[in-house]
């Protein structure tokens, strides 16, 4: 913690501004009042303070809302988000996406994944759920982003937002997330043709389960290979070597190449030999 | 060893119903879709309805979509075949069958259903 | 939907006759066609899928071949057993649908 000492009545703040960048640590601790400070937060990030005087402004602001900052204040943080804990954000009750835009431009080029992450379910939490909005402005501003919520908070998404949602939205998505997005997806995409469907759900297939990967098999999509590497393990093993074949279509050939890769291989070692061998790939259980 | 039973058909009158139960053993049913083909007094064959091994999907020709509905239980090893509004044309022997992928793999011996006044 | 019809609708043939029976889908439907053997009174049994795979236990003097839109199902040596209706279906996609059926009769 900085030590207090009193203000030189020279040094005395009756504004912030661009003054300040001269005042040393102890004097910026001792001369700038804090509700002064949280009032004219959106002068803040055009002032170059160093990051030490950073410190001493988050200090002031920590104390002034020790149960966490209002959304007047976080709005105009600036560069001072970067000195952001996920244990401080945490505390915060954010509901503007226009915070969230200004939030997610500072923390771009910086490694801020934790606070970030922590910013986007404290947004979901004080909206009440992922809206079509919330998604538009992740999608734009954090692509990527939209896997750092947890699976409780992504059960929040209404499945009419799901077309909002782009493949590489969900490329850091983990089996448990996509478990959650999958049937929202489905249901999202449920009127849609085969083919049409298929290029729209097949972002989601991670979460699919072993009944919906073979009703796709009646749809001549013809998976590619990297989607179904995707699958989860548990869906691929009860496919048939017919489903599988039926699955994947022209693309049935790169079975061979991933053969020794999940979830290929341990389907590969669930079929009977006889099975394999009507593929015609050379591939052995 | 796959065996497939059916049972339930039987003279029914132009507009009436019929169910049709299929009794599976010798492999996990609860893995497969199953369908129902039929086929008519000396012709050919016709696939009537496929439903998925969890029962979420069927599938349907034009010519029974609307009045043939499949179902299955899986706690019992059982496929039906609900059959309502049946018509004459609907006359044939329908036949259980396990399908694997694209494939009819194993076939019931088939029940007689006749249409007629 | 994807029409399959075969030909001939019905042979004559002795014993140890090699016999072939056509095919023809309507549209490309790849390898995804299957034959069926009918015996009168008895339910089909799968002979061949994916065009010329043997189903199990099936004897190796049933073959199938061709792609696309033409298939064969070729019976090399025609052994007593054999007399029935054959059919074929194709499984590319739905509705899946059958030929009317070639009938393999003693000469």
């Known amino acids: 913690d900085v030590e207090r000492t009193t203000c030189p009545p020279e040094k005395e703040v009756h504004e912030i501004d661009e003054n300040l960048i001269f005042y040393k640590k102890r004097e910026l601790e001792a001369c700038v009042d804090a509700a002064l400070l949280a009032a004219q937060m959106d002068r803040v990030d055009a002032i170059p303070f160093t990051y030490e005087q950073l410190d001493v402004l988050k200090h002031k602001l920590d104390e002034l809302y020790p149960q966490g900052y209002p959304e007047s204040v976080i709005r105009h943080l600036g560069h001072l988000f970067l000195k952001m804990s996920p244990e401080d954000i945490r505390k915060w009750n954010v509901t503007s996406l226009e915070t969230l835009k200004a939030l997610l431009k500072v923390s771009k080029g910086h490694e801020m994944s934790a606070q970030v992450a922590t910013l986007i379910d404290r947004v979901v939490v004080g909206r009440g759920q992922l809206d079509k909005d919330t998604v538009d402005t992740l999608t734009a501003f954090c692509p990527g982003c939209l896997c750092s919520l947890s699976p409780e908070r992504l059960s929040s998404v209404p499945p009419s937002v799901i077309g909002a949602v782009r493949p590489q939205d969900l490329d850091t998505c983990g089996p448990r997330q996509l478990d959650v997005l999958y049937p929202k997806a489905r249901l999202a995409f449920q009127n849609m043709s085969g083919s049409e469907y298929f290029v729209k759900i097949r972002p989601f297939l991670g979460g699919a389960p072993t009944e919906d990967l073979k009703a796709l098999s009646q749809q001549n999509v013809s998976m590619d290979l990297a989607t179904f590497m995707k699958l989860r393990r548990e869906a691929v093993l009860p496919l048939t070597v017919a489903e599988v074949q039926k699955l994947l279509g022209p693309h049935v050939e790169g079975l061979k190449v991933e053969e020794q890769h999940s979830p290929v291989r341990d389907w590969i070692l669930k079929q009977r030999q006889d099975d394999l061998d009507t593929l015609g790939l050379g591939l052995q259980g | 060893e796959v065996q497939l039973v059916e049972s339930g058909g039987g003279l029914v009158q132009p507009g009436g119903s019929l169910r049709l139960s299929c009794a599976a053993s010798?492999?996990?049913?609860?893995?497969?879709?199953m369908s129902w083909v039929r086929q008519a007094p000396g012709k050919g064959l016709e696939w009537v309805a496929t439903?998925?091994?969890?029962?979420?999907?069927?599938y349907y020709p034009d010519s029974v979509k609307g009045r043939f509905t499949i179902s299955r239980d899986n706690s019992k090893n059982t496929l039906y075949l609900q059959m309502n509004s049946l018509r004459a044309e609907d006359t044939a022997v329908y036949y259980c069958?396990?399908?694997?992928?694209?494939?009819?793999?194993?076939w019931g011996q088939g029940t007689l259903v006749t249409v007629s006044s | 939907d994807i029409q399959m019809t075969q030909s001939p609708s019905s042979l004559s043939a002795s014993v140890g006759d090699r016999v072939t029976i056509t095919c023809r889908a309507s549209q490309d439907i790849s390898n995804y066609l299957n034959w069926y053997q009918q015996k009168p009174g008895k339910a089909p049994k799968l002979l061949i899928y994916y065009t010329s795979r043997l189903h199990s236990g099936v004897p190796s003097r049933f073959s199938g071949s061709g792609s696309g839109t033409d298939f064969t199902l070729t019976i090399s040596s025609l052994q007593p057993e054999d007399f029935a209706t054959y059919y074929c279906?194709?499984?590319?996609?739905?509705?899946?649908?059958f030929g009317q059926g070639t009938k393999v009769e003693i000469k």
């Open positions: 279906q194709q499984g590319n996609t739905l509705p899946y649908t």
């Open positions: 010798g492999f996990t049913f609860s893995d497969y879709f």
């Open positions: 439903i998925s091994n969890g029962g979420t999907y069927t």
């Open positions: 069958a396990r399908f694997d992928g694209y494939i009819f793999d194993y």
